[in-house]
Interface confidence: medium
């Protein structure tokens, strides 16, 4: 019997969804040469959840309307989970003077407008890094800017108007660094069609080694959205990302670097990235810095993370201590480091997925170990997981909603630590909540920096 139109539409949506998840989220359907094995429905569901989580949609695991709308939105062709070319965590340019060449020009715009848009797009990144870009007209450039349609020699065919607008390759020789723009789009200097400057800023981010961001305000967010180019600025996330690869501009710094200067400890708006006890001390992490607070003493000292642990990154996002083992776990993105007796253990970082998180979890917001239960609580967005440190596995029945089980806390938190045998201290922005886990309620509301006598 022929399919009725709604079944047919549903089938098309599923096929479209599969294709999208294959391209951008590494779904391995394996319906082609390697094997005729069918993927499990769970794998598809998990990939939908991963996509929804990354793009800030409601995580349902279903191809619902908002998910399909997002899948149809014009976007960059680089995957959100990495298959493309060694981004993220891959190569960077090992020099500060980088050349680019415009291989050919789109007929949609004047040549001078193309030159200007591309030059301004490079300038966006040189403003916040030590990188200097210069255009060459002949010879081999580090970054080649190409307008092409359909299949164009790099295994990543463009798809006509809409859909994929452009893609770029991470730093490297040959095709490395090159940025390709789909000639089937209508490229413009304004809000009509597809704005070349905005798209180029994004693609050059890839050319410099950045992956996609899940922050909708970031220029490195995967989907295209026009913003006023006269007031356009990189988000803090974009700046943090690029400066983690290249550092900040050494001279003529034109844009403030959120990680550059030591944050003011008594700023009433101060928030922390992660907090944990280490023996009788409390470590407060923020950007490249940490403050050390020795219990019951008013004095605190600020240090660079790299001065204590040179092999660790800045921007630690979560931390917890198992005091009985003299172990501290530090988390950033999908990796974690183990510190034993204040020394980093070899063979780290490792993947957070070794704890048993599903694939869509890409970073941990906060973590805390409770020695009374020998359990670690991991907070991710508005949910939390509970991990049995003895059995080295996640407890069943998780994740659960933070707001449901921690009265008055949430929906999301920045940091948490355990102290005095009965309290969790939760940090949310510039606020801190002392939470009695036996009474299961907040017992005090404080400023985040209350530990410093501010």
């Amino acid at each position: 019997l022929p399919l009725n139109s709604s079944t047919s539409l549903e089938k098309n949506n599923v096929l479209f969804g599969e294709r999208y998840l294959e391209k951008f989220y590494g779904l391995e359907i394996n319906k082609l040469p390697v094997t005729k094995m069918k993927y499990s429905g769970n794998l598809m569901k998990e990939k939908i959840q991963e996509m929804q989580h990354f793009l800030g949609l409601k995580v349902t695991g279903q191809l619902d309307t908002s998910t399909l709308e997002m899948m149809h939105a014009p976007r960059c062709g680089v995957p959100d989970v990495h298959h493309f070319r060694e981004m993220p965590g891959g190569p960077v340019w090992r020099k500060h003077y980088i050349t680019y060449r415009i291989n050919n020009y789109t007929p949609d715009m004047n040549r001078e407008d193309v030159d200007y848009a591309i030059r301004k797009a490079f300038q966006v990144w040189s403003n916040v890094t030590p990188l200097k870009f210069s255009k060459i007209n002949t010879g081999m450039a580090d970054i080649l800017v190409v307008f092409a349609r359909g299949a164009h020699g790099d295994f990543h065919a463009f798809d006509g108007k809409g859909g994929i607008l452009a893609h770029a390759f991470g730093p490297g020789s040959g095709i490395g660094g090159d940025a390709h723009f789909d000639e089937d789009e209508f490229w413009t200097t304004h809000s009509g069609g597809t704005n070349l400057f905005l798209t180029a800023v994004h693609e050059i981010g890839h050319s410099l080694g950045l992956g996609h961001s899940s922050d909708p305000k970031a220029v490195m967010f995967p989907t295209y959205k026009y913003v006023d180019i006269n007031t356009f600025r990189l988000s803090a996330d974009d700046i943090r990302g690029i400066q983690s690869l290249y550092g900040d501009p050494k001279e003529n710094q034109r844009l403030p670097n959120p990680d550059n200067s030591e944050p003011a400890l008594c700023d009433p708006n101060l928030s922390f990235d992660a907090v944990t006890t280490v023996g009788n001390k409390i470590f407060f992490f923020k950007d490249r810095f940490f403050w050390l607070k020795v219990s019951e003493r008013p004095k605190t000292s600020v240090n660079l993370i790299s001065s204590l642990w040179p092999t660790l990154p800045s921007g630690i996002e979560a931390a917890y201590e198992i005091e009985a083992r003299n172990q501290v776990f530090l988390f950033k993105d999908d990796k974690y480091w183990l510190i034993s007796n204040l020394r980093p253990e070899p063979n780290y970082p490792k993947s957070i997925h070794s704890f048993g998180f599903p694939n869509f979890v890409k970073k941990i917001d906060a973590a805390v170990f409770n020695p009374r239960f020998y359990r670690t609580y991991f907070f991710v967005d508005n949910q939390y997981w509970r991990y049995d440190e003895r059995r080295q596995m996640m407890d069943p029945g998780y994740p659960k909603l933070i707001t449901k089980n921690f009265q008055g806390i949430g929906p999301k938190i920045d940091a948490v630590f355990y102290s005095k045998n009965k309290y969790y201290y939760f940090f949310q922005g510039s606020n801190q909540f002392e939470y009695d886990f036996l009474l299961q309620r907040i017992t005090k509301t404080l400023k985040s920096n209350s530990w410093f006598g501010c």
């Epitope: 298959h83 065919a157 006509g160």
Partner: antibody, heavy 126, light 108 residues
Framework: EVQLLESGGGLVQPGGSLRLSCAAS???????QMWWVRQAPGKGLEWVS?????????GYADSVKGRFTISRDNSKNTLYLQMNSLRAEDTAVYYC???????????????????WGQGTLVTVSS | DIQMTQSPGILSLSPGDRATLSCRAS???????LAWYQQRPGQSPRLLIY???SRATGIPDRFSGSGSGTDFTLIISRLEPEDFASYYC?????????FGPGTKVDIK
């Protein structure tokens, strides 16, 4: 620079076993589908086996099904082919190959090879 | 399985000549999922063409591919000394993938 270095080939008697290894470098191994392709002396190319990027799915040519096992260790950037119950007709140069993520207008294909190793010779003879 | 045949088996030509190599599939190859590889004596194969007509990175423009369905062609417009080698077609639209037996281009 992408490099694929096969090892483990050699002379083996019919019915014997060999384990081939392929050390990969110069790219993010864990994100690529990988294949073994073989070439009998003076003959053409034959796809032998493939494995998905995570190792979660595998496939085999009918001629080796049940005798060969493909596997990978992404933490070591290494691809393996365990060959049991070897036959004279398995004599060939075995190439370790990388399969790029190729998208065209009709979707996703992991179906062609962009890099080949130098090959390792397996000779099955009594 | 999709069977691939190539003709001629051997093509004897001189440098500067135009070479036309043919590849035929036993059934239609979906989405022009056909690749061509070159194998020089004593070396591993290398990818020349994919998607029937797209040149792989670094491949000179004297190599061009065409065709769809069951009939595909590789043309080398002007043979250079390094082009004398064996050429294999491969389909990847059906499972399992299959290679043709090859065409050897040798010097006349």
């Amino acid at each position: 620079e992408v490099q694929l270095l096969e090892s483990g080939g050699g002379l083996v008697q019919p019915g014997g076993s060999l384990r081939l290894s392929c050390a990969a470098s110069g790219f993010t191994f864990s994100t690529y589908q990988m294949w073994w392709v073989r070439q009998a002396p003076g003959k053409g190319l034959e796809w032998v086996s493939g494995i998905s990027s995570s190792g979660g799915a595998t496939g085999y040519a009918d001629s080796v099904k049940g005798r060969f096992t493909i596997s990978r260790d992404n933490s070591k950037n290494t691809l393996y082919l365990q060959m049991n119950s070897l036959r004279a007709e398995d004599t060939a140069v075995y190439y370790c190959t990388r399969v790029p993520h190729y998208y065209d207008s009709s979707g996703y294909y992991g179906g062609l090879v962009d890099y080949w190793g130098q090959g390792t010779l397996v000779t099955v003879s009594s | 399985d999709i069977q691939m045949t190539q003709s001629p088996g051997i093509l004897s030509l001189s440098p500067g000549d135009r070479a036309t190599l043919s590849c035929r599939a036993s059934q239609s190859v979906t989405s022009s999922s056909l690749a061509w590889y070159q194998q020089r004596p004593g070396q591993s194969p290398r990818l020349l063409i994919y998607g029937a007509s797209s040149r792989a990175t670094g491949i000179p423009d004297r190599f061009s591919g065409s065709g769809s369905g069951t009939d595909f062609t590789l043309i080398i417009s002007r043979l250079e000394p390094e082009d004398f080698a064996s050429y294999y077609c491969q389909q990847y639209g059906g499972s399992p993938i299959t290679f043709g037996p090859g065409t050897k281009v040798d010097i006349k």
